[in-house]
């Protein structure tokens, strides 16, 4: 209703003597803010004088008169909406009712908080969850229904009193909804801790004992079992019998089946607590174990290892790793089944005994071809010695031997000639399959390593062959030592260095890159013509008339061999030049006259200069000069020059005439 | 230093002729390491030589294929000019004419004349 | 009649760039070539004769290269005043003929 004061708070607040309350309070009043607060305790109305009566604890008025009480508590509140109290210390005759007598300008509220004040520390309050089972982990919750600013108070959990390794966390709520000091562990019980006390315990800021709570752990757990056997060592003999006994040490809730269990696999129509063996056989010895149930599920207990001891079985050889590469290690195992275990063995090589060898295992770490063979062994322990089984077959593998590549022509080899090689070994295991030659070529190969070189090359200097089983042995290479006429012939100009030009000495070379046998002709030619037999053509001073093609050749006693055609170019200045005209050197004015300057020149001629009879020179730089209209002043002697980038050249004079045209004579 | 100046109409009537003068200054006509050019300039043919004329030991003249029907360039030693006379002209022959020297030293046109814009117009 | 072909017909640059511009002959012209420069509404201007020779006056940054066809005309850092035509020619046989221009314009 509005025209209520409201106020939040705790309704109880708890604590007890000599300790301290807060109370954390907001209130909104109706109307302005607050004028005067008086706190009661126990207040009571009395209707003669519109007034509470009680005990004032605390009060605010205008003119701020404050009694002595008001020490111990206190007012932390405000004019509009704080009404936070404190009571410190806190006394057993201050349980009851506080009353908050509230006055603003025009409204008055009283508003009532219960305190309850025991005489002694009241004690906390364990929380548990409804089912505990083992190793599942839980929450633990001590709650105590105080929290004061002034009175620091502890919670500590303790294990059949000793405090618990467990970290605990603490919190405090202070607030307008609640006021508790709460204590959570997290804690995986064991089923040992199955009907312990677990102590809550209250404690001041010096941890003095103040109160506490203690429950029983209630743990719920799979049957624990012990298992006993009679011999205690579990180890018998073929025949011997075996008893094994199983006791339930704890379990929550009670038990309700049995059963024994061996290498894992439960044993059938065996539901009691003990198991009898009578004349065990080997193939009894094996890891046993009894499994009770109960609600929880189903517990087991340690392993029994049972062991049947008898004399080994016939042995058999294991061979790492057969077959054997020649050069690598190998290792036998002697395998024999015995309890005991093996003490000693007799190792045989194709049924011979091999000396010094009575190890389990035999190791070679270098094998050879003549460790091939049978290996068997006889296994002993103290029940008697084994028989001597099968044995193993030890292949030993390697690449063939000596190999040999041989040349099966009559020598020497000429280029061209066909060859035919054979490849040779001594011995292979695995047998030979193949062949390889070196270099690669495409070669026949008619039957098995042998190898035919059609029209053999000349540079085909040396073959290997290799004989192949899982690997290849590769023969030393064989010189085929082929003869063949001179190769690579080519003319090359040893001077001058640069470009020829015309007047220059010149030589040229006759170059081979080889040839077999080494002793060589030389013969140089030009158009068919025989010009010298010696590896060099010199020329003292080169005409531009030497130009031409120009071929050398080489020959020994398997034949001859000539150069491409070389062309010797000689670059020499223009000459030969002469000025030719058309139509002639005769023409009538007015029609057009065309000078040609002719040259023989190498490079071509690049521009040409023209000039008059009196060496003027005229703006052209053409082949051709055109005068058109030509005019009878035109009429005299001309010459030009030819440049190229080796030099100049100049023609000799050539006469123009210009006639007069018969209408200019019949102007006359 | 040399100088070419160029004088003459710049409208001209069709089937007319055209005449243009270029006067010298710095050099002479008559010069034997010269050669006197006329060039146009016209958007449809860009810059093209019509023609020269120039001195050795006689006058000697060149003329561009195009033109040469109806071209006639004259030295005038006594004005030290020389002239260009275009005959029969078209609209065609509208464009920028420039007189220029060609030294034989360097084969190019080193001096221009500051250009004449003719218009051939009916 | 001699050819001459010249290649960019325009370019877009900017100062400070380098300019190459080609010229080709439709035969051997030896050496006879030479580039000029017009501005608009001006006579052109002789920049460089004989391929490669640097006309007096002209600044260093223009440069020219070539014989035979194929010619070239280099301006290594464009300046502001070198936005114009230019245009190449060949003096080695009558007719005289020019190359159709190329123009060079900011960017």
């Known amino acids: 209703d509005s025209s209520k004061w409201v106020f939040e708070h705790p309704e109880t607040l708890y604590a007890w003597e000599g300790a301290c309350v807060w109370i954390p309070c907001t209130y909104r009043a109706l109307d302005g803010d607050l004028e005067s607060f008086i706190l009661f305790h126990n207040p009571e109305y009395n209707k003669n004088t519109s007034k509470f009566d009680g005990t004032r604890l605390y009060e605010s008025t205008k003119d701020g008169k404050v009694p002595s009480e008001q020490k111990r508590v206190q007012f932390l509140g405000d004019k509009n909406k704080n009404c936070t109290l404190s009571i410190h210390p806190v006394h057993l005759n201050d349980s009851g009712q506080l009353g908050l007598r509230m006055e603003s300008k025009t409204e008055k509220w009283m508003e009532r908080i219960h305190l309850n004040v025991s005489e002694r520390p009241f004690p906390p309050h364990i929380q548990l969850p409804p089912e505990i089972q083992e190793s599942q982990e839980v929450t633990l919750t001590c709650l105590l229904n105080f929290s004061c600013y002034g009175y620091p108070i502890q919670l500590q959990w303790l294990l059949e009193g000793v405090p618990m390794r467990q970290a605990a966390v603490t919190s405090t709520s202070l607030t307008i909804k609640s006021v508790f000091t709460r204590s959570e562990l997290k804690f995986s019980p064991q089923w040992s801790h199955h009907g312990k006390i677990v102590t809550c315990q209250l404690q001041d800021a010096d941890g003095k004992f103040l109160s506490n709570d203690t429950v029983q752990l209630n743990v719920k757990h799979t049957p624990k079992l012990e298992i006993k056997v009679t011999p205690s060592d579990a180890i018998v003999r073929e025949g011997d019998s075996v008893t094994m006994t199983c006791e339930v040490s704890s379990s929550n809730p009670e038990y309700t089946t049995v059963s024994w269990l061996k290498d894992g696999t439960s044993l059938k129509k065996q539901n009691t607590f003990t198991l009898n063996l009578r004349e065990v056989t080997k193939d009894q010895s094996g890891k046993y174990c009894c499994q009770v149930s109960n609600d929880v599920g189903p517990g087991r207990s340690e392993e029994v290892f049972l062991q049947v001891q008898y004399a080994p079985e016939p042995s058999t050889v294991q061979i790492l790793h057969s077959p054997a590469v020649e050069g690598s290690q190998v290792e036998f195992l002697c395998m024999s089944l015995a309890n005991p275990l093996p003490t000693n063995y007799t190792w045989y090589h194709n049924g011979k005994e091999m000396q010094g060898r009575t190890e389990e295992k035999v190791h070679i770490p270098k094998i050879l071809p003549w460790h091939a063979g049978t290996y068997s062994c006889v296994a002993e322990n103290i029940l008697g010695t084994g028989q001597r089984g099968p044995g193993a077959e030890l292949d030993v593998q390697y690449p063939p031997k000596k190999v040999t590549t041989v040349i099966q022509n009559p020598m020497p080899i000429r280029e061209g000639d066909t060859v035919t090689l054979s490849c040779n070994y001594n011995s292979s295991n695995p047998s030979v399959t193949r062949y390889e030659w070196k270099p690669h070529g495409a070669w026949e190969e008619p039957s098995l390593g042998v190898l035919k070189i059609q029209n053999v090359g000349w540079d085909n200097t040396t073959i290997a062959c290799a004989a192949c089983n899982s690997w290849c042995s590769w023969a030393s290479p064989v010189a085929l030592n082929v003869q063949y006429a001179p190769r690579d012939v080519r003319v090359r100009k040893i001077k001058p260095l640069s470009e020829i030009h015309s007047g220059n000495s010149v030589s040229l070379q006759c170059d081979f890159s080889s040839s077999h046998p080494k002793e060589v002709q030389f013969f140089w030619e030009k158009n068919g013509r025989l010009l010298g037999k010696e590896s060099q053509l010199n020329f003292d001073s080169i005409s531009p008339e030497d130009a031409g093609s120009y071929s050398c050749w080489v020959n020994n006693s398997i034949g001859q061999t000539a150069s491409k055609a070389w062309t010797l170019e000689v670059l020499y200045a223009p000459r030969r030049l002469r000025v030719s005209m058309s139509p002639g050197d005769q023409v009538m004015e007015g029609k057009s006259a065309t000078l040609t300057c002719e040259s023989d020149a190498n490079p071509p001629v690049s521009h040409y200069t023209w000039f008059d009879w009196n060496n003027q020179s005229l703006p052209y730089h053409s082949q051709k000069l055109r005068l058109e209209p030509v005019k009878v002043q035109h009429s005299g002697a001309y010459w030009c020059q030819g440049t190229n980038s080796v030099g100049k050249g100049r023609s000799p004079l050539s006469t123009l005439t210009v006639y007069y045209s018969p209408e200019t004579i019949g102007r006359r | 230093q040399v100088q070419l100046q160029q004088s003459g109409p710049g409208l001209v009537k069709p089937s007319q002729t055209l005449s243009l003068t270029c006067a010298i200054s710095g050099d002479s006509v008559s010069s034997n390491s010269a050669a006197w050019n006329w060039i146009r300039q016209s958007p449809s043919r860009g810059l093209e030589w019509l023609g020269r004329t120039y001195y050795r030991s006689t006058w000697y003249n060149d003329y561009a294929v195009s033109v040469k029907s109806r071209i006639t360039i004259n030295p005038d030693t006594s004005k030290n000019q020389f002239s260009l006379q275009l005959n029969s002209v078209t609209p065609e022959d509208t464009a920028v004419y420039y007189c220029?020297?060609?030294?034989?030293?360097?084969?190019?046109?080193?001096?221009w004349g500051q250009g004449t814009m003719v218009t051939v117009s009916g | 009649d001699i050819q001459m072909t010249q290649s960019p017909s325009s370019l877009s640059a900017s100062v400070g760039d380098r300019v190459t511009i080609t010229c080709r002959a439709s035969q051997s012209i030896s050496s006879y070539l030479n580039w000029y420069q017009q501005k608009p509404g001006k006579a052109p201007k002789l920049l460089i004769y004989?391929?490669?020779s640097l006309q007096s006056g002209v600044p260093s940054r223009f440069s020219g290269s070539g014989s035979g066809t194929d010619f070239t005309l280099t301006i290594s850092s464009l300046q502001p005043e070198d936005f114009a035509t230019y245009y190449c020619q060949q003096s080695y046989s009558t007719p005289l003929t020019f190359g159709g221009g190329t123009k060079l314009e900011i960017k």
């Open positions: 004989a391929a490669s």
């Open positions: 220029a020297r060609e030294v034989s030293g360097t084969s190019a046109f080193d001096i």
